[in-house]
């Protein structure tokens, strides 16, 4: 899978993680910090 950085207009999209762009799927994806989940890393898990 080929990945690059997300475009600058995606700044802040991932609430607790890093945005990466999945080139093959033409989709943005959030790589969450430890302890977070969700498509935008929006949920802390207890």
């Amino acid at each position: 899978v080929s990945i690059t950085k997300c475009s600058s207009d995606m700044n802040g999209y991932c609430l607790h993680g890093q945005c990466i762009y999945l080139v093959d799927m033409s989709q943005n994806y959030c790589r969450c910090e430890v302890g977070y989940t969700g498509v935008r890393c929006e949920h802390f898990f207890l």
Epitope: G38, R40, E42, H43, F45, L46
Partner: antibody
Framework: QVQLQQSGPELVKPGASVKISCKAS????????INWVKQRPGQGLEWIGW????????YYNPKFKGKATLTVDKSSSTAYMLLSSLTSEDSAFYFC???????????WGQGTLVTVSA | DVLMTQTPLSLPVSLGDQASISCRSS???????????LEWYLQKPGQSPKLLIY???NRFSGVPDRFSGSGSGTDFTLKISRVEAEDLGVYYC?????????FGGGTKLEIK
């Protein structure tokens, strides 16, 4: 308009598995979570987990890990929940509900009744 | 997990009365965004739950203004200013701040 259409009632034997469906329409399927909620007859609501359809991400309530498996078919905008090793405790209504990121359950399916009986 | 405790379990009211339902979370459900994802749902017999209130105090579209939500931190309240027959059913609070999400145990609003 947004609609979630669930599959019909199921009568299954103890120890068996059942797969129920939730067909979404009226919105872009890959832009919202599909959540699943359990309700035993006369009882309250229990949250099972969610699936984000694309790219697929799931989260399960630890209580339902190993009991429920959530999947999607993007081509038909349908979410599925497989319930395995069924016992009488799994006899319940199961609802699907749509939830955008950090938004409420604004839309619900009509519910699917699963009855586990020998 | 966050435990959501609703009181009372049953609430007998006369039509036209005010009704108040309490929901207490076992820990703070304030999100890192500063929002609190506390919601209220009404389920009538034989129906799916319906959204009434989201983010503590916001009425969902089409919900009458006799419904209001309030609270912060761990203590939340749903008030119905003048109960009508169509309001009868089971009310659930719910939090969607952390995972796993949890529902309260429900409060049955019934005629006295």
């Amino acid at each position: 308009q947004v609609q979630l259409q669930q599959s019909g009632p199921e009568l299954v034997k103890p120890g068996a598995s059942v797969k129920i469906s939730c067909k979404a329409s009226g919105y872009t399927f890959t832009d919202a979570y599909i959540n699943w909620v359990k309700q035993r007859p006369g009882q309250g609501l229990e949250w099972i987990g969610w699936i984000w359809p694309g790219p697929v991400i799931t989260y399960y309530n630890p209580k339902f890990k190993g009991k429920a498996t959530l999947t999607v078919d993007k081509s038909s905008s349908t979410a599925y929940m497989l319930l395995s090793s069924l016992t009488s405790e799994d006899s319940a209504f199961y609802f699907c509900a749509r939830r955008e990121v950090l938004s409420p359950f604004a839309y619900w399916g009509q519910g699917t009744l699963v009855t586990v009986s020998a | 997990d966050v435990l959501m405790t609703q009181t009372p379990l049953s609430l007998p009211v006369s039509l036209g009365d005010q009704a108040s339902i309490s929901c207490r979370s076992s820990q703070s459900i304030v999100h890192s965004t500063g929002n609190t994802y506390l919601e209220w749902y009404l389920q009538k017999p034989g129906q799916s739950p319906k959204l009434l209130i989201y983010k503590v105090s916001n009425r969902f579209s089409g919900v009458p203004d006799r419904f209001s939500g309030s609270g912060s931190g761990t203590d939340f309240t749903l008030k119905i200013s003048r109960v009508e027959a169509e309001d009868l059913g089971v009310y659930y609070c719910f939090h969607g701040t952390h995972v796993p999400y949890t529902f309260g145990g429900g409060t049955k609003l019934e005629i006295k």
